[in-house]
């Protein structure tokens, strides 16, 4: 999906209002310095591409993020403010259902959500030069 035509300011507002709080809740009890950010993004469409991938695509050691509260709200925000997004997700959801395991917060998931927090922070500051 090409995130170029999304309403970035509304997605940012939804993130600041509630999605960010849900990410913090998920990470509660984890030190903010525990994980190094290894995933980066260069502009808002790229950031949303990476956020979508880390949130909804199962990875080795972490297959359960798509059912978390922050993921449900992320999906809602992308569907509402990115034209045609919801129509592109049918195949992705079928793959997700096959990969889904019981909800277990593994260290790998915590690391992945830490990466997500970094991507969202970068999404919110699009004018900053890449480090």
């Amino acid at each position: 999906y090409d995130f170029t035509n999304c309403d970035f300011e509304k997605i940012k507002a939804a993130y600041l209002s509630t999605i960010s709080k849900d990410l913090i809740t998920y990470m509660s009890g984890t030190k903010s310095t525990e994980f190094n950010n290894t995933v980066s993004c260069s502009n808002r469409p790229h950031c949303l591409t990476e956020i979508q991938s880390l949130t909804f695509n199962p990875t080795a050691g972490c297959a359960s993020l798509a059912k978390e509260m922050f993921a449900m709200k992320t999906k809602a925000a992308l569907a509402i403010w990115c034209p045609g997004y919801s129509e592109t997700q049918i195949n992705a959801t079928q793959a997700m259902k096959k990969a889904r395991k019981s909800k277990v917060t593994t260290n790998k998931c915590l690391e992945q959500v830490s990466q997500l927090q970094g991507l969202w922070r970068r999404f919110n500051r699009p004018l900053l030069k890449q480090q």
Epitope: K10, K21, A79, S86, E87, I90
Partner: antibody, heavy 122, light 108 residues
């Protein structure tokens, strides 16, 4: 304007199934999660589950797994809830409720259907 | 599962009286995830207060909401006849979504 129109009251036999509908208009049906909420006579509200019509993704309250099946038909902008193996405990009003971001970007159930009464009786 | 405990369950207030309804949450949640709904008999619930303190469209300014962590409240500064209803708090912090048992507010 956003409207959720639910199907009419149902009187059904114990052990049978019933499927109630919630037709949406005034917004992009595929892009919003649809919730279902149960209210027994004189009681409070109980969340059953939700469906994302765009891809059919669902999340259920564990108390209703096996009892309810949520589906959506994008061609008619209609969400459905099927209740199976009905008992008197299932006699209630069932609401559909869209969830979305309000003007302050808080996420909540912002539009509700008028409710469908299901009575289980022999 | 997050449990929301409302108090009182039932109360009556005179016109002009100040009314406070509380919602205690079993584990701490973000204030952005606590909402209030109003329901009058035989009708569907209406969104009333979003994110602890933000009034939904059309809600009179005599209503207000506050709280954080595990303790939240809805306040009516001057009770009016049209405020007689049942009020529910609800959390959107974790699954399953849960509601308080409701506070039925009657006109004295």
């Amino acid at each position: 304007q956003v409207q959720l129109q639910q199907s009419g009251a149902e009187l059904v036999r114990p052990g049978s199934s019933v499927k109630i509908s919630c037709k949406s208009s005034g917004y992009a049906f595929s892009s919003y999660w649809m919730n279902w909420v149960k209210q027994r006579p004189g009681q409070g509200l109980e969340w059953i589950g939700q469906i994302f019509p765009g891809d059919g993704d669902t999340t259920y309250n564990g108390n209703f797994k096996g009892k309810t099946t949520l589906t959506a038909d994008k061609s008619s902008n209609t969400a459905y809830m099927q209740l199976s193996s009905l008992t008197s405990e299932d006699s209630a009003v069932y609401f559909c409720a869209r969830s979305g971001f309000d003007y302050g970007y808080f996420y909540a159930m912002d539009y509700w259907g008028q409710g469908t009464s299901v009575t289980v009786s022999s | 599962e997050i449990v929301l405990t409302q108090s009182p369950t039932l109360m009556a207030a005179s016109p002009g009286e100040k009314v406070t309804i509380t919602c205690s949450v079993s584990s701490s949640i973000s204030s952005s995830n606590l909402h209030w709904y109003q329901q009058k008999s035989e009708t569907s619930p209406k969104p009333w207060i979003f994110g602890t303190s933000n009034l939904a469209s059309g809600v009179p300014v005599r209503f207000s909401g506050s709280g954080s962590g595990t303790s939240y409240s809805l306040t009516i500064s001057n009770m009016e006849a049209e405020d007689a209803a049942t009020y529910y708090c609800q959390q959107w912090s974790s699954y399953p979504l849960t509601f308080g048992a409701g506070t039925k507010l009657e006109l004295k």
